[in-house]
């Protein structure tokens, strides 16, 4: 992949001193896994397992690798060209509107609803009304309202081991 990231793509506080105008789009850029030296002459490798860059760039520093939080598992480690990939532990999920933390999946659906989707690292269980088939809003019901899987139902991947 030969997409480019230049100083202009960064927030003002991340930018280095302005570079001279380049005669071709990639002149003066360094490959993924590298950053440019302060004098703009050399390409310096990112530090394996510590930082990375994903595109051709003129960054003065590589980007710091993400550390997986507790409650997350590391799917793949940080390399010089790819950030760490973290995923919520089994039984938890990360919502788009609260990506900063993993939330516990519900253990069952409210009364009058059936489960049609399992807990995954990126979504809670999915419930629909038995009759209408419309989805539930997703609020966790009171415990006494919860309908849990019957003994004959296969356990979902997000069933909590307690």
């Amino acid at each position: 992949e030969s997409a480019l990231i230049t100083q202009q793509d960064l927030a003002p506080q991340q930018r280095a001193a302005p570079q001279q105008k380049r005669s071709s789009p990639s002149e003066g850029l360094c490959p993924p896994g590298h950053h440019i030296s302060e004098d703009g002459r050399d390409c310096i490798s990112c530090k394996y397992g510590q930082d990375y860059s994903t595109h051709w760039n003129d960054l003065l520093f590589c980007l710091r690798c993400t550390r997986c939080d507790s409650g997350e598992v590391e799917l793949s480690p940080c390399t010089t060209t790819r950030n760490t990939v973290c995923q919520c532990e089994e039984g938890t999920f990360r919502e788009e509107d609260s990506p900063e933390m993993c939330r516990k999946c519900r253990t069952g659906c409210p009364r009058g609803m059936v489960k049609v989707g399992d807990c995954t690292p990126w979504s809670d269980i999915e419930c629909v009304h038995k009759e209408s088939g419309t989805k539930h809003s997703g609020e966790v019901p009171a415990v006494e309202e919860t309908v849990t899987s019957s003994p004959g139902t296969p356990a979902s991947p997000c069933s909590l081991s307690g």
């Epitope: 030969s2 490959p31 993924p32 896994g33 050399d42 490798s45 394996y48 051709w56």
Partner: antibody, heavy 120, light 107 residues
């Protein structure tokens, strides 16, 4: 499998230019950086520069910057290294080499080498 | 430029011996060190990169270690086909530089 096949040996006079080719096969040509490394008789290895066919990015060793031209023809998956103003100390085997992975600049695949002799 | 100083420059050893070659960088190269084997009239062959990662197909008797400025290539039990010249390389910063080589000869 990955192969880098270089052009044949050359004999040149001091002050002349030489153009060495390196034809790549067995992988997507535009995905990997190609490097040029030379080795004078009985001596060690010296990095000349790289060419990345994906965006025509070139990085040259300052020592050769004014004399080396790196180009490519993507239609034939061939990279070229031209060295001008040749002198006797440029007598060496010139190798093209490909990165082992996309952007880690260590060289897992090498051409067979092209001997360039500079002699009056 | 980063200088890579390799030692020894030559070494005599016997089949079955354990051999160690060292490389010292003039500055920290953050484990971005590679090792190559070269036989006369042939192109170099990559053995190790990122200081300790063995290249595909390289026998397990070859191992690399080190960090900062000091790197080592070890051959645990020399085989007849291992007699060759070995080079270290820093792949940390352009211009990439190599050690001057260690010629491993049969005792």
């Amino acid at each position: 499998q990955v192969q880098l096949v270089q052009s044949g040996a050359e004999v040149k006079k001091p002050g002349a230019s030489v153009k060495v080719s390196c034809k790549a096969s067995g992988y997507t040509f535009t995905d990997y950086i190609i490097h040029w490394v030379r080795q004078a008789p009985g001596q060690g290895l010296e990095w000349i520069g790289w060419f990345y066919p994906g965006n025509n990015n070139i990085k040259s060793n300052e020592k050769f910057k004014d004399r080396v031209t790196l180009t490519a023809d993507t239609s034939t998956s061939t990279v070229y290294m031209e060295l001008s103003s040749l002198r006797s100390e440029d007598t060496a085997v010139y190798y093209c080499a490909r990165n082992e992975d996309n952007y880690g600049n260590f060289f897992g695949y090498w051409g067979q080498g092209t001997l360039v002799t500079v002699s009056s | 430029d980063i200088q890579m100083t390799q030692s020894p420059s030559s070494l005599s050893a016997s089949v079955g011996d354990r051999v160690t070659i060292t490389c010292k960088a003039s500055q920290d190269v953050n484990t971005a060190a590679a090792w190559y084997q070269q036989k006369p009239g042939k192109a170099p062959k990559l053995l190790i990169y990122w200081a300790s990662t063995r290249h595909t197909g390289v026998p397990s008797r070859f191992s690399g270690s080190g960090s900062g400025t000091d790197y080592t290539l070890t051959i645990s039990s020399l085989q007849p086909e291992d007699f060759a010249t070995y080079y270290c390389q820093q792949h940390y910063s352009t211009p990439y530089t190599f050690g001057q080589g260690t010629k491993l000869e049969i005792k």
